[in-house]
């Protein structure tokens, strides 16, 4: 089932997705799409990275994190009710059927009646758990020609992830409300 995240109309929404690049030079291609992850690729692609860059994006969708260090979390600017729905983060690990697929549900709530001035990157998010694929411990290593070696394992809890991460600082600095549960 999808993990749910929330934002208010007019704010920026944040959908977390992480992995750990195994080698500095070669990132793993990642795609973000609107709609649940299909068998291959992403449907309705809104943003895509390759081995080094963000190489495709559409208006309002961008990566604000250290994407070259594996933080491929998606920011959606100035959301509307139409942005509600399922989003797919797909980490395209070389090899057959090796992709990590995450479905994240974004719920947009109407803005409060008395709007407070919002700062850039303000958002309110519910984080039941953090979706990560980080190299902590044993995992199968896939190698394909000149593509990068990937060493990936999953970690599930937000608390562990936030304890010493930049994200915690970013969230605090942006005035965000974090709910864990």
């Amino acid at each position: 089932s999808e993990v749910e995240y929330r934002a208010e109309v007019g704010q920026n929404a944040y959908l977390p997705c992480f992995y750990t690049p195994a080698a500095p030079g070669n990132l793993v291609p990642v795609c973000w799409g609107k709609g649940a992850c299909p068998v291959f690729e992403c449907g309705n692609v809104v943003l895509r990275t390759d081995e080094r860059d963000v190489n495709y994006w559409t208006s309002r969708y961008w990566l604000n994190g250290d994407f070259r260090k594996g933080d491929v979390s998606l920011t959606i600017e100035n959301v509307t009710l139409a942005d509600s729905g399922i989003y797919c983060c797909r980490i395209q690990i070389p090899g057959i059927m090796n992709d990590e697929k995450f479905n994240l549900k974004l719920v947009i709530k109407p803005a409060k009646v008395t709007p407070a001035p919002t700062r850039q990157r303000d958002f309110t998010a519910a984080f039941p758990r953090m979706l990560t694929t980080r190299g902590h411990g044993p995992a199968e290593t896939q190698t394909l020609g000149s593509l990068p070696d990937i060493n990936l394992t999953q970690i599930s809890t937000l608390a562990n992830e936030l304890r010493d991460s930049r994200l915690a600082n970013d969230l605090r600095d942006s005035g965000a409300t974090i709910r864990i549960g």
Epitope: G25, N26, E51, R52, D53, V54, N55, W62, R68
Partner: antibody, heavy 120, light 107 residues
Amino acid sequence: QVQLVQSGAEVKKPGASVKVSCKASGYTFTDYYMDWVRQAPGQGLEWLGYIYPNNGGTSYNQKFKGRVTMTTDKSTSTAYMELRSLRSDDTAVYYCARGGYYSYYSYDYWGQGTTVTVSS
Amino acid sequence: DIVMTQSQKFMSTSVGDRVSITCKASQSVGNNVAWYQQKPGQSPKLLIYYASNRYTGVPDRFTGSGSGTDFTLTISNMQSEDLADYFCQQHYSSPYTFGGGTKLEIK
């Protein structure tokens, strides 16, 4: 210490090709991207493309696609940038620059520059 | 292509001044911006990477700030050796693009 040493100045006629070399030392050549940037006289900086010596992967600025080729020789830790069908507005100083992963692919080391003059 | 705009081509300054050079991206580039210093006849030198990280050996009077589309390089205590051209660059998406440069001059 890290050094990028480029080949000497070139004078070319319109329509000709030029191949600039960049010899790297002081680091593991295959661990870092090599980008190429040029600067026309009195102008700003313009990115031509990059090559990843580890696997030969390249990405070129669309503006130069079909005219530029980047290669490396791992045995000599040397990167090459060839520009074909030269025009007068290709007159510029051409730099190789190391794309540092830990500096988010900004350029932590630059070559001294190679002046390419295109004139009939 | 993402356009990086440095609106001030020249800035007059005096030793000891606080100088702020601005750079605006045509669309969000996160924090993927670098600042370079270039003196006449020399190659550019990296000052700031990832918008606010001072590169090794760069004096702490140089500070970078900003995120998204608006970025600033600040020199807190201008020195004569800081007279140079300054370029911003986005490395979020290729083609990587540079601002047109800002030249610091003495008043």
